[in-house]
């Protein structure tokens, strides 16, 4: 899977969309999870309604909401009041029993609020790395990772 970058401004809302084949994933609930490390597990943040037919109802977990257009085949995640710690790699998933298929890998970038004059030093952007595979960009504001970019901040 390529990684799609979605950029949002700190303090504002960011909407992430994940298109999918509505028939291939018929009847399946969806989820939004956060990748813990480059090879670590994906920790569930929020999932759609327990009843698939009610997947269009928005479900919240803290400041993150999820809603699914099961006929159109678009999963939408809203990150409200975006904060620097929200930056990182996520996945949109389609759930089947104990299994989860990745619909899209998403890198969330948090940009400094241009009207906020506080220190933006804690805002994180991906660094350079020759090892990261190709990625695809789509604007929401969103883009794909450039070749060589890494989706995780360097560890000290």
């Amino acid at each position: 899977h390529n990684t799609t970058v979605f950029q949002g401004v700190a303090g504002q809302s960011l909407q992430v969309s994940c298109p999918y084949d509505s028939m291939k994933h018929w009847g399946r609930r969806k989820a939004w999870c956060r990748q813990l490390g480059e090879k670590g597990p994906c920790q569930r943040v929020v999932s759609t309604h327990n009843l698939w037919l009610l997947s269009f109802l928005r479900r919240w977990n803290g400041s993150t909401a999820i809603t699914d257009d099961t006929l159109g085949g678009t999963l939408t995640i809203t990150l409200r009041n975006l904060q620097p710690h929200d930056a990182g790699l996520y996945q949109c998933q389609s759930l089947h029993g104990s299994e989860a298929d990745t619909l899209r890998k998403v890198l969330v970038e948090v940009l400094a609020d241009p009207l906020d004059h506080r220190d933006a030093g804690d805002l994180w952007f991906p660094g350079e790395s020759e090892s990261f595979e190709d990625a695809h960009v789509e604007h929401s504001i969103s883009r794909s990772l450039l070749e060589g970019e890494i989706p995780f901040p360097p560890t000290s």
């Epitope: 028939m23 291939k24 299994e99």
Partner: antibody
Framework: EVQLVQSGAEVKKPGESLKISCKGS????????IGWVRQMPGKGLEWMGI????????RYSPSFQGQVTISADKSISTAYLQWSSLKASDTAMYYC???????????????WGQGTTVTVSS | EIVMTQSPGTLSLSPGERATLSCRAS???????LAWYQQKPGQAPRLLIY???SRATGIPDRFSGSGSGTDFTLTISRLEPEDFAVYYC?????????FGGGTKVEIK
């Protein structure tokens, strides 16, 4: 009428290749998963793998991974099961089946082909 | 992989009697991802139950499924002559979507 029609019985020698088919009709072939199931003589059902003809996404049982290839040609609404080198132990009845569209994503196989008998003998 | 164990291997009953077939999974099957099939000699299997308890289209209401976790049951309330066949359970919780070994329901 929704149906899956499989190709006819095959008699082959060990080491030969084979490709059997499963043609769907009466429904949108590209939008349902198609599974393959083996039944050896006098034995039970064994799940081999599944394919989504819309994009050819395929999942195999570890027992059959590398032993067979599952494919599909959506332009002619047909799924395939093939072997590059048959063994006597491949002698069995092979069924294709459609996974229904159910709330919850259940893969209950609601439409079955009539089965293809494959006999491998020297 | 999840191993499905069916019992008994053979069930000898008379028409009109109640049949209770058991299927046990080696690991918990989430959200009741379990199906039941009927197979008669020389025929392809037929889907009876999906989601542990939902009857497939056209299946008579004498067939019912129940259970969760690792233990599932198929019940035929009153056996009809056409119900004597082999029954298989299958989990579709986790690939590979394994079948049980089958239970043969025969006429006593």
């Amino acid at each position: 009428e929704v149906q899956l029609v499989q190709s006819g019985a095959e008699v082959k020698k060990p080491g030969e290749s084979l490709k059997i088919s499963c043609k769907g009709s009466g429904y949108s072939f590209t939008t349902y998963w198609i599974g393959w199931v083996r039944q050896m003589p006098g034995k039970g059902l064994e799940w081999m793998g599944i394919i989504y003809p819309g994009d050819s996404d395929t999942r195999y049982s570890p027992s059959f991974q590398g032993q067979v290839t599952i494919s599909a040609d959506k332009s002619i609404s047909t799924a395939y099961l093939q072997w590059s080198s048959l063994k006597a132990s491949d002698t069995a009845m092979y069924y294709c089946a459609r996974a229904g569209h159910y709330d919850g994503g259940h893969l209950g196989m609601d439409v079955w082909g009539q089965g293809t008998t494959v006999t491998v003998s020297s | 992989e999840i191993v499905m164990t069916q019992s008994p291997g053979t069930l000898s009953l008379s028409p009109g009697e109640r049949a209770t077939l058991s299927c046990r999974a080696s690991q918990s099957v989430s959200s009741s991802y379990l199906a039941w099939y009927q197979q008669k000699p020389g025929q392809a299997p037929r889907l009876l139950i999906y989601g542990a308890s939902s009857r497939a289209t056209g299946i008579p209401d004498r067939f019912s499924g129940s259970g969760s976790g690792t233990d599932f049951t198929l019940t035929i309330s009153r056996l009809e002559p056409e119900d004597f066949a082999v029954y298989y359970c299958q989990q579709d919780d986790r690939s590979p979507y394994t079948f049980g070994g089958g239970t043969k329901v025969e006429i006593k």
